[in-house]
Interface confidence: medium
């Protein structure tokens, strides 16, 4: 006769481990007794189970309430048992030695390996303005065992570095994605792939990139030189710019309070029908957290009763 | 050949404990599973618990929790704590062991009474 099991046994941590020990014999060869040990490097070999064709199954009280034999129907040469809830401490050599009349007793190891998934954290890195050099974007930490694969998933460019520490029992891997900020990454998701034979599918973390900006400013409303004539209504600036944060925007007038009547609505100042008095220097300012910016406009409101006067169009930043 | 030799036995109220104990002529080691059965009068033999030579405890159902097999090889010696003694429990107690050589050699102790009282 022979014994049939096998050389490794996989099991995810939480879950039931059967452990395989099958007597292959003659007709009328019978199982005595099945006996199931913990074999240690350190303690040696310890009893965890034996299954007993008379008195039935014994377990160690140290596995108490764990150890089972699989479910009916059962065949009397199979002496497997189940482990159940198997932990990381589980992990090692089990040895199964099957005691037969006549042909004696056998025996086998076999090695237990519990998968114990990562749980993978992503912490974004210091927050992210254009014009910096090299930055940490985000690192990405896992810990199980055995070590888990940790890599990116994203159409920005920039580099990954990993590092892995070795526990007992496990070992954590934290890798760190490294890029040069521009507003183009704004708002472009890095995900953390996280891989692990533990897993039935990679886990995966997304962080949003936030990257800190602000665009030089403009203003637009004077290209249309016959709005900007007395008694026209409806004339109006707008300041042109963009930012993240988003931007705030402030109008003031060089040479003076802004004329009665000029209304300011976030990045637009709005004009009542136009009178000379309106000619002057408009100023649009532009702040966010990391910046700001100024771009001003000469406005001359032109007299369709004065024909030696045309409207003057000069932008400067 | 095993001699067996039980002791511990006697008149107990219900709700009470005893402790049984079982006493082989040679090393325990090489004695596989060690038990007990009883015997009440006028009723066949009942399996009790057994323990084996690692430590390993099976318990029939009716006093899983009650009773604690344990052994100490050492001293070749085989123990039944009973607690919570009920009037049922009343038998003769027999200790068992188990031999496997070329096939398995089962001896038998001379047992000893117990009396559990309501």
């Known amino acids: 006769g022979e014994l049939e099991t096998s050389d490794v046994v996989t099991v995810v941590l939480g879950q039931d481990a059967k452990l395989p020990c099958f007597y292959r014999g003659d007709p009328d060869e019978q199982v005595g007794q099945v006996a199931w040990a913990r074999v240690d490097p350190n303690e040696g070999i310890r009893e965890l189970a034996l299954l007993h064709s008379k008195y039935g199954l014994h377990v160690n009280p140290a596995y108490e309430d764990r150890v089972e034999q699989p479910p009916p129907p059962r065949d009397p040469l199979d002496g497997s048992v189940l482990l159940r809830n198997a932990v990381q401490a589980d992990e090692g050599e089990y040895e199964c030695r099957v005691s037969t009349f006549p042909a004696g007793s056998f025996q086998a190891r076999m090695r237990l390996r519990v998968l114990v998934p990562p749980l993978p954290s992503l912490n974004p890195g210091p927050p992210l303005e254009e014009g910096q050099g090299l930055t940490l974007a985000a690192s990405c930490t896992a810990e199980g065992s055995p070590a888990p694969s940790v890599t990116w998933d994203t159409e920005v460019k920039g580099t990954q570095s990993s590092r892995s520490f070795t526990h007992p029992r496990s070992a954590a891997v934290t890798s760190e994605f490294h890029l040069v900020p521009s507003r183009s990454m704004n708002g472009q998701p890095l995900t953390c792939v996280v891989s692990h034979p533990g897993l039935l599918q990679d886990r995966r973390i997304t962080h949003t990139l936030q990257v800190a900006f602000l665009a030089e400013a403009s203003v637009r409303g004077l290209e249309d030189q016959n709005l900007w004539q007395v008694g026209r209504e409806g004339a109006t600036l707008k300041c042109l710019s963009e930012g993240q944060p988003p931007p705030k925007y402030n109008w003031t007038r060089l040479d003076g309070p802004l004329p009665s009547g000029v209304r300011v609505k976030g990045d637009t100042l709005g004009f009542p029908p136009l009178t000379t008095e309106h000619s002057g220097v408009y100023v649009c300012h532009v702040s966010n957290e990391l910046s700001s910016r100024d771009s001003q406009v000469t406005v001359e409101v032109l007299d369709p009763e004065d024909p030696g006067k045309q409207v003057d169009l000069v932008s400067a930043s | 050949e095993v001699q067996l030799v039980e002791s511990g036995g006697g008149l107990v109220q219900a709700g009470g404990s005893l402790r049984l104990s079982c006493a082989a002529s040679r090393s325990t080691f090489s004695l596989n599973i060690m038990g007990w059965y009883r015997q009440a009068p006028g009723k066949q033999r009942e399996y009790v618990a057994t323990?084996?030579?690692?430590?390993?405890?099976n318990y029939a159902d009716s006093v899983r929790g009650r009773f604690t097999i344990s052994r100490d090889n050492a001293e070749n010696t085989v123990y039944l704590q009973m607690d919570s003694l009920k009037p049922e429990d009343t038998a003769v107690y027999y200790c068992?062991?188990?031999?496997?050589?070329?096939?398995?050699?089962?001896?038998w102790g001379r047992g000893t009474q117990v009396t559990v009282s309501s």
């Open positions: 323990i084996t030579s690692g430590g390993s405890t």
């Open positions: 068992t062991a188990e031999l496997v050589r070329r096939g398995p050699t089962t001896y």
